[in-house]
Interface confidence: medium
């Protein structure tokens, strides 16, 4: 999906209202310096691409993020503020429903959510000239 035409400011507002707090809740008890941020993004569409990938694509050691509250709210925000996003996600959603529900907070998941926080931070505050 090409995130170029999303309403970035509306997504930012959704993040500030709820998603950010859910990420903090998920990471509670973890030190802010515990993980090195290795994932980066250069502009807002790129940040959303990386955010979508880390949030919804299962990775080795962390297969359960898509069911978390912050992930569901992220999905809702993208569906509302990115034209045509919902349509591209139907197949992905059906595939997700077939997987067993597994709510395990692994260290790998914590590391992944730490990466997500950095990506969201970058998305929300690109340097002023990029706005």
């Amino acid at each position: 999906y090409d995130f170029t035409n999303c309403d970035f400011e509306k997504i930012k507002a959704a993040y500030l209202s709820t998603i950010s707090k859910d990420l903090i809740t998920y990471m509670s008890g973890t030190k802010s310096t515990e993980f090195n941020n290795t994932v980066s993004c250069s502009n807002r569409p790129h940040c959303l691409t990386e955010i979508q990938s880390l949030t919804f694509n299962p990775t080795a050691g962390c297969a359960s993020l898509a069911k978390e509250m912050f992930a569901m709210k992220t999905k809702a925000a993208l569906a509302i503020w990115c034209p045509g996003y919902s349509e591209t996600q139907i197949n992905a959603t059906q595939a997700m429903k077939k997987r067993r529900k597994r709510k395990v907070t692994t260290n790998k998941c914590l590391e992944q959510v730490s990466q997500l926080q950095g990506l969201w931070r970058r998305f929300n505050r690109p340097l002023l000239k990029q706005q």
Epitope: E9, S32, T33, S40, G118, N124, R125, L128, Q131
Partner: antibody
Framework: EVQLVQSGAEVKKPGSSVKVSCKAS????????MHWVKHAPGQGLEWIGA????????SYNQKFKDRATLTVDKSTSTAYMELSSLRSEDTAVYYC?????????????WGQGTTVTVSS | EIVLTQSPATLSLSPGERATLSCRAS??????????MHWYQQKPGQAPRLLIY???NLGSGIPARFSGSGSGTDFTLTISSLEPEDFAVYYC?????????FGQGTKLEIK
């Protein structure tokens, strides 16, 4: 503990340059925008510019664009602000500041300030 | 650039009194229903300290006697009952539009 520690006071001649450092600790330096703010005697606060350590991208207040250079050294989690062609009106306290965690656009952590005096 | 005008320039009050500081922007600092206006306190020889973010949210560790309100172009910082340590300079700041700007400050002094 999250903190920013700046280099010591400087006394410079007009026309010379000064480079102020700001060492970060207690947070993931590469994912926060780092800003520099000027506070001249008897004046208000003035934004100089910002840098994103993740890729070195910068944004400047047009007023300082020609004379200020912002850089970072990710290996030491240090931000730098170099000001060239110094003049008397550059006499001020210079602060580095971290932009907030969420992206609200406020400064939640500040350095202690570096006094730069420009005098012949 | 957005110009922030703070008033009054100096406010003389006594401990226990209520302080009302104003910040007016030359154009709206709102975006998608959020007001990107922040307030700082600065004491002599110290770095500024965040008081209020996004118009009305209390910064970490800031006493409840501080509050912020407003949207669009008009914003207010209120200190409900002044403590001796509240006498300082207060700045508003916007980051909605390039370049980021601060107000010129309001000095709150003991009467």
């Amino acid at each position: 503990e999250v903190q920013l520690v700046q280099s010591g006071a400087e006394v410079k001649k007009p026309g010379s340059s000064v480079k102020v450092s700001c060492k970060a600790s207690g947070f993931t330096f590469s994912t926060y925008n780092m800003h520099w703010v000027k506070h001249a005697p008897g004046q208000g606060l003035e934004w100089i510019g910002a840098i994103y350590p993740g890729n070195g991208e910068t944004s400047y207040n047009q007023k300082f664009k020609d004379r200020a250079t912002l850089t970072v050294d990710k290996s030491t989690s240090t931000a730098y602000m170099e000001l060239s062609s110094l003049r008397s009106e550059d006499t001020a306290v210079y602060y580095c500041a971290r932009e907030d965690d969420y992206g609200e656009g406020y400064f939640d952590v500040w350095g202690q300030g570096t006094t730069v005096t420009v005098s012949s | 650039e957005i110009v922030l005008t703070q008033s009054p320039a100096t406010l003389s009050l006594s401990p226990g009194e209520r302080a009302t500081l104003s910040c007016r922007a030359s154009e709206s600092v709102d975006n998608s229903g959020l007001s990107f206006m922040h307030w700082y306190q600065q004491k002599p020889g110290q770095a500024p300290r965040l008081l209020i973010y996004r118009a009305s949210n209390l910064g970490s560790g800031i006493p409840a006697r501080f509050s912020g309100s407003g949207s669009g172009t008009d914003f207010t910082l209120t200190i409900s009952s002044l403590e001796p340590e509240d006498f300082a300079v207060y700045y508003c700041q916007q980051i909605n539009t390039d370049p980021l700007t601060f107000g010129q400050g309001t000095k709150l002094e003991i009467k």
